[in-house]
């Protein structure tokens, strides 16, 4: 379990627009702590950009993500 | 680089609608919040509150009632509405854009504010 | 609503530490807060120096910390400089809605 004083990324909302997915280096989960879902992916500029993991774009590049791993 | 500018009426009848646009420049709005923050004159700073990317909103319960937040992606903007003004909403109003993600400076870019007085 | 509470002012010498406390009416203040301390320069030019409880924004000097201290989110400056006289405020989520703090005038002299 994480230390209380440990803060969790979470997400206060999505982005809603499909990110290019050549822009994307990694991605993780967020926590079950959250109060809701996430994938935060990481582009290849270090930028985090939180995305709905009920969409299939997001399915899919976590999917592809974990293929070339 | 990142901007945010609010436009606003100046002067305000009580009873009366208030309506400000917040134009952005430098980012989406499709990847980032934006939220409304009032400071009234020598007083701190109120949270009214936040439209997300996909367009849900958050509002101050206090305030629920009579504000409403919209946007429109391709011009940039964000609109503040709120209804039956009184003199105690007289306040410098602010726009601030908020990154999604929990870990990141919540309200990091401010706008300028626009003055709203309400009298008759 | 909750309510957030702040040191109204606090006076600093240049090169010394300053803690800048944010309390909560709720209960202690947690890591789901998401502490953010906001910097209010002469002229309404507000800047979000931290986010998440203890992260600096890009560009903000890391004489600037965030963190819980007890039951209350602090912010600390170490090594205080004269730019640094501010009015600062904190925020804290509570689950849907952000409340701040009254702020606290740090004078630096």
């Known amino acids: 379990s994480l230390a209380a004083d440990t803060p969790t990324a979470c997400c206060f909302s999505y982005t809603s627009r499909q990110i290019p997915q050549n822009f994307i280096a990694d991605y993780f989960e967020t926590s079950s702590q959250c109060s809701k879902p996430g994938v935060i992916f990481l582009t290849k500029r270090s930028r985090q950009v939180c995305a709905d993991p009920s969409e299939e774009w997001v399915q899919k590049y976590v999917s592809d993500l974990e293929l070339s791993a | 680089q990142v901007q945010l500018k609010e436009s606003g009426p100046g002067l305000v009848a009580p009873s009366q609608s208030l309506s400000i646009t917040c134009t952005v420049s430098?980012?989406?709005?499709?990847?980032?919040?934006i939220h409304w923050v009032r400071q009234p004159p020598g007083k701190g700073l109120e949270w009214l509150g936040v439209?997300?990317?996909?367009?849900?909103?958050n509002y101050n319960s206090a305030l629920m009632s009579r504000l409403s937040i919209s946007k429109d992606n391709s011009k940039s903007q964000v609109f503040l509405k709120m209804n039956s003004l009184q003199t105690d909403d007289t306040a410098m109003y602010y726009c601030?854009?908020?990154?999604?993600?929990?870990?990141?400076?919540?309200?990091?870019?401010w706008g300028q504010g626009t003055s709203v007085t309400v009298s008759s | 609503q909750a309510v957030v509470t702040q040191e109204s002012a606090l006076t600093t010498s240049p090169g010394e530490t300053v803690t800048l406390t944010c309390r909560s009416n709720?209960?202690?203040?947690?890591?789901?807060?998401?502490a953010n301390w906001v910097q209010e320069k002469p002229d309404h030019l507000f800047t979000g120096l931290i986010g998440?409880?203890?992260n600096r924004a890009p560009g903000v000097p890391a004489r600037f910390s965030g963190s819980l201290i007890g039951d209350k989110a602090a912010l600390t400056i170490t090594g205080a400089q004269t730019e640094d006289e501010a009015i600062y405020f904190c925020?804290?989520?509570?689950?849907?809605?952000?409340?701040f703090g009254g702020g606290t005038k740090l004078t630096v002299l």
């Open positions: 709720t209960g202690a203040v947690t890591t789901s807060n998401y």
């Open positions: 998440g409880t203890n």
């Open positions: 439209i997300w990317p996909g367009g849900g909103t």
């Open positions: 925020a804290l989520w509570y689950s849907n809605h952000w409340v």
């Open positions: 601030a854009r908020g990154p999604l993600i929990t870990t990141e400076v919540s309200m990091d870019y």
């Open positions: 430098g980012f989406s709005l499709t990847g980032y919040g």
